[in-house]
């Protein structure tokens, strides 16, 4: 099952997702998709990345993080009903069908018409790389099978390691990472 | 206007080893997915291998794996099929084709090449 | 691996009818599905793709839905040039796959 992430509408979404280069600037290409992980690259694509730089990206679509260390978590700004569904982040690893592929389900709610209450807003005060998610972890947690036998370190997910927002602080540590080299 | 010409097929014995190539023009060659793909005479589609823009990540079927490599030079935008211990199984015509962008179909293929394993 | 079983194997119909084409899989594709129309000699070409979008230059009497395991390819009015073998193809697990193929002749 896909991990569940949450935002509401008008709010921006976030979906994390991250790789660790084998030396600064030896980026791997990264593709992010609207829809399931295909066999190939990534449906629907949104956001791509090669070797160097960003190459592909549409409206609203963008990385907030430092893509040049592997933090290719995706941002989508002012989030409708419509962009609920299941988002494709592939990381395609040199080699011999190496690529990993994370699917992560995002769900929309209605805006609220309360304020978000104090704890919430603590929260993202307390840790301004989440501004964008409310705070929201994932709902569900999501094994993932064992890597190609290569120099990786076993993938670590956000919704292993991320229990609920109290966990927040490892989030750069404990997201959908994959360490290469 | 896209076009993808396939070459190198030919015959040769079981055990032999032939290299095809997959000239292609009409669209950015370093940007897209291709794979090749074979036809047995008389026989549906079969998906061979698979390599991305950069040629970082290639992906093969389990009845090439270990004897074909797929490998590009983007720099003459070509696609090539490296094939080692060829079986009578392997008679085929080859075609490449180019991703559609999202990596879920094929939407420009060439016209094939045909190899032929006999002794 | 994922099964692609299309049926019938071969159609027989005449031009200006309705030719109704299958493709079942093994296990859910998603929306992963293409087709593709084969004529003797030549290479396969591109007619629907991610289920139900026709491609670039496709006439509108091609239509193809379903979505999961059940897959229809739909030609409204066959056209002389219709008469073809069409393959379905998914590319949702791995490894990608092929139908078998559904012929579709002259009666």
């Known amino acids: 099952s896909e991990v569940e992430y949450r935002a509401e509408v008008g709010q921006n979404a976030y979906l994390p997702c991250f790789y660790t280069p084998a030396a600064p600037g030896n980026l791997v290409p990264v593709c992010w998709g609207k829809g399931a992980c295909p066999v190939f690259e990534c449906g629907n694509v949104v956001l791509r990345t090669d070797e160097r730089d960003v190459n592909y990206w549409t409206s609203r679509y963008w990385l907030n993080g430092d893509f040049r260390k592997g933090d290719v978590s995706l941002t989508i700004e002012n989030v409708t009903l419509a962009d609920s569904g299941i988002y494709c982040c592939r990381i395609q690893i040199p080699g011999i069908m190496n690529d990993e592929k994370f699917n992560l389900k995002l769900v929309i709610k209605p805006a609220k018409v309360t304020p978000a209450p104090t704890r919430q807003r603590d929260f993202t005060a307390a840790f301004p790389r989440m501004l964008t998610t409310r705070g929201h972890g994932p709902a569900e947690t999501q094994t993932l099978g064992s890597l190609p036998d290569i120099n990786l370190t076993q993938i670590s997910t956000l919704a292993n390691e991320l229990r609920d927002s109290r966990l927040a602080n490892d989030l750069r540590d404990s997201g959908a990472t994959i360490r290469i080299g | 206007e896209v076009q993808l010409l396939e070459s190198g097929g030919g015959l040769v014995q079981p055990g032999g080893s032939l290299r095809l190539s997959c000239a292609a023009s009409g669209f950015t060659f370093r940007t897209h997915l291709i794979s090749w793909v074979r036809q047995a005479p008389g026989k549906g589609l079969e998906w061979v291998a698979a390599i991305t823009g950069s040629g970082g990540s290639t992906y093969y079927a389990d009845s090439v794996k270990g004897r074909f490599i797929i490998s590009r030079d983007n720099s003459k935008n070509t696609l090539f099929l490296q094939m080692n211990s060829l079986r009578a199984e392997d008679t085929a015509v080859y075609y490449c084709a180019k991703d559609g962008g999202s990596g879920s179909y094929d939407d420009f293929w060439g016209q094939g090449t045909l190899v032929t394993v006999s002794s | 691996e994922t099964v692609l079983t299309q049926s019938p194997v071969t159609l027989s119909l005449s031009p200006g009818e309705r030719a109704t084409l299958s493709c079942r899989a093994s296990?859910?594709?998603?929306?992963?599905l293409a087709w593709y129309q084969q004529k003797p000699g030549q290479a396969p070409r591109l007619l629907i793709y991610d289920a139900s979008n026709r491609a670039t230059g496709i006439p509108a009497r091609f239509s193809g839905s379903g979505s999961g395991t059940d897959f229809t390819l739909t030609i409204s009015s066959l056209e002389p040039e219709d008469f073809a073998v069409y393959y379905c193809?998914?590319?949702?697990?791995?490894?990608?796959?092929f139908g078998q193929g559904t012929k579709v002749e002259i009666k």
């Open positions: 296990q859910s594709v998603g929306s992963y």
């Open positions: 193809q998914q590319r949702s697990n791995w490894p990608p796959t």
